[in-house]
């Protein structure tokens, strides 16, 4: 659970994060697992520890091995292990499987390829991107922040994509490359103005005071992968996060795909221990995409005791 595989190429920078995380103020000690020898924190060393990070600047094949990190909070010491493998540079263009990060898939509507592990490094834009070792050129390719966007994705855009960037440490520059496969989903998708499936507009829901109730906001946005599709609840026109009432919590949006192929998202508003004042609120289900915003309002009313008895 608290062991993590990391890999890199010789003569490149490699930065590894301790699998046990904690506050930045927690002391983190790093050791070579085999020898129990402490890893120095002085930056003049080629391999040194910097808080939760272990830095190889640059890495050598001989650095391969298991490293122990101990995160020392005021109350507990928690141990993690980083299993590091440094490989020799490949003479040819082929990137072996063991150097590949997780595969990502995209479609015509969503073609972002994130550069793996880049958030660990001190880098500056732009990134360089390569496909099957060829530098990417042309207006279809846009390097944006830490990802690559491909316009009008086609099936032959599938392949291995490598990002290359420079890590800067105290004025010294080190090269880093990372490769992942990109697959293309052949999807005849489309996007349209949001359609809210639930609740109905101006609906009223009967609730019992003191009971728990759930309100579901469900909307569909078209077919296939959507570039932007969001649903959320608002209370009296305010975001849930701005409404300081822990009894009322919104769940993360859940993606759904119905039998008709529609791309839909829903989110549940959970209201615990319903109170009288909850009946005075306006609950808005908001659905948003690039076409615009649709809003359905629902209110709560007290369940009629006569109905309850029947």
């Amino acid at each position: 659970k608290f062991s993590k595989q990391s890999w890199g190429l010789e003569n490149e920078a490699l930065i590894v994060r301790c699998p046990r995380q904690g506050k930045s103020s927690y002391i983190v000690d790093w050791y070579y697992s085999q020898t129990n020898k402490s890893i120095p924190t002085q930056e003049r060393n080629r391999v040194f520890a910097s808080g939760q990070l272990l830095k190889f600047l640059p890495a050598e094949v001989a650095d391969s091995g298991i490293y122990t990190c101990i995160v020392r909070s005021p109350t507990f010491n928690r141990t993690g292990y980083a299993n590091v493998t440094i490989y020799k540079k490949q003479p040819d263009c082929n990137v072996p499987d063991y150097l590949m990060y997780s595969t990502v898939s995209g479609s015509e509507k969503n073609s972002k390829i994130y550069c793996p592990t880049i958030d660990l490094y001190n880098w500056t834009a732009p990134l360089e991107w390569f496909k099957n070792c060829q530098a990417l050129q042309g207006s279809r390719y846009k390097a944006h922040k830490s990802f690559l966007v491909i316009d009008n994705v086609m099936t032959d855009d599938a392949g291995d994509y490598t990002c290359k960037f420079i890590h800067n440490e105290n004025g010294a520059n080190y090269s880093v490359t990372a490769t992942r496969s990109f697959t293309v989903k052949d999807e005849q998708g489309f996007s349209r103005f949001p359609v809210i499936r639930a609740p109905a507009h101006n609906e009223t829901k009967e609730v019992e005071i003191g009971e728990n109730t759930n309100l579901t906001c469900s909307a569909c946005f078209g077919k296939g992968a959507q570039f932007l599709a969001a649903v959320q609840w608002q209370l009296n026109g305010n975001k849930i996060t701005d409404f300081s009432e822990p009894r009322i919590q919104q769940e993360e949006g859940q993606n759904q795909s119905f039998s008709d192929g529609l791309a839909c998202v829903n989110t549940v508003l959970r209201i615990a221990d319903v109170k009288e004042e909850d009946l005075l609120l306006r609950y808005d289900c908001l659905a948003l995409n690039l076409h615009g915003l649709r809003r359905h309002t629902i209110r709560l009313s007290r369940k009629n005791p006569i109905d309850h008895q029947s």
Epitope: R20, Q21, G22, K23, S25, S73, P74, T75, F76
Partner: antibody
Framework: QVQLQQSGAELVRPGASVTLSCKAS????????MHWVKQTPVHGLDWIGT????????AYNQKFKGRATLTADKSSSTAYMELSSLTSEDSAVYYC??????????????WGQGTSVTVSS | DVVMTQTPKFLLVSAGDRVTITCKAS??????VAWYQQKPGQSPKLLIY???NRYTGVPDRFTGSGYGTDFTFTINTVQAEDLAVYFC?????????FGGGTKLEIK
């Protein structure tokens, strides 16, 4: 949603022991520390100690060490605090509270409703 | 143990006023300070963590600042529902310790 449900009020004799429970729901019990806090009108809030439910490791405030014992049952997602050799000074409301140590917010973000303990002969 | 000295103990203010509570640590606690609100008959609620980060759902009239030994908690425009006791707490070193609390009353 996250909830910490504490056991009911206790009336105990001086010298006796009491065990309070705190049942967690709505999150992965082993991903957060469980802390216990004592509150009295005179002394305000006092940190008793904490348990890591994943490992069973504990840490105590020296003030309570030897008298407070924290345990956790992963199967029922319940944390317990036993307080022994009770005196009238132990009359207080006791809270269990969840503490995130791996990511923000680093703090006691959810609290139980509290258990009132009265020590009296 | 780190002693958290919180002042004032009591505050009597009018709705709309700006309120400032201070907490002084007996030694440096970096920015490992949280602020809690406890309304009458309720459990404490986390408002601010890491000295200045507002917890989810907390209105932006509540702010925190400070580093090292001196910390400040401010309510910019006090509302009637802010009637409560406010506590600071450090979790930089064990045992974790709380301030004595500030009781806020509305005129």
């Amino acid at each position: 949603q996250v909830q910490l449900q504490q056991s009911g009020a206790e009336l105990v004799r001086p010298g006796a022991s009491v065990t309070l429970s705190c049942k967690a729901s709505g999150y992965t019990f082993t991903d957060y520390e469980m802390h216990w806090v004592k509150q009295t009108p005179v002394h305000g809030l006092d940190w008793i100690g904490t348990i890591d439910p994943e490992t069973g490791d504990t840490a105590y405030n020296q003030k309570f060490k030897g008298r407070a014992t924290l345990t956790a049952d992963k199967s029922s997602s319940t944390a317990y605090m036993e307080l022994s050799s009770l005196t009238s000074e132990d009359s207080a409301v006791y809270y269990c509270t969840r503490y995130s140590y791996t990511n923000s917010p680093y703090g006691m973000d959810y609290w139980g409703q509290g258990t009132s303990v009265t020590v009296s002969s | 143990d780190v002693v958290m000295t919180q002042t004032p103990k009591f505050l009597l203010v009018s709705a709309g006023d700006r309120v400032t509570i201070t907490c002084k640590a007996s030694q440096s606690v970096s920015n490992d300070v949280a602020w809690y609100q406890q309304k009458p008959g309720q459990s404490p609620k986390l408002l601010i963590y890491y000295a200045s980060n507002r917890y989810t759902g907390v209105p932006d009239r509540f702010t925190g600042s400070g580093y090292g030994t001196d910390f400040t908690f401010t309510i910019n425009t006090v509302q009637a529902e802010d009637l409560a006791v406010y506590f600071c707490q450090q979790d930089y070193s064990s045992p974790y310790t709380f301030g004595g609390g500030t009781k806020l009353e509305i005129k």
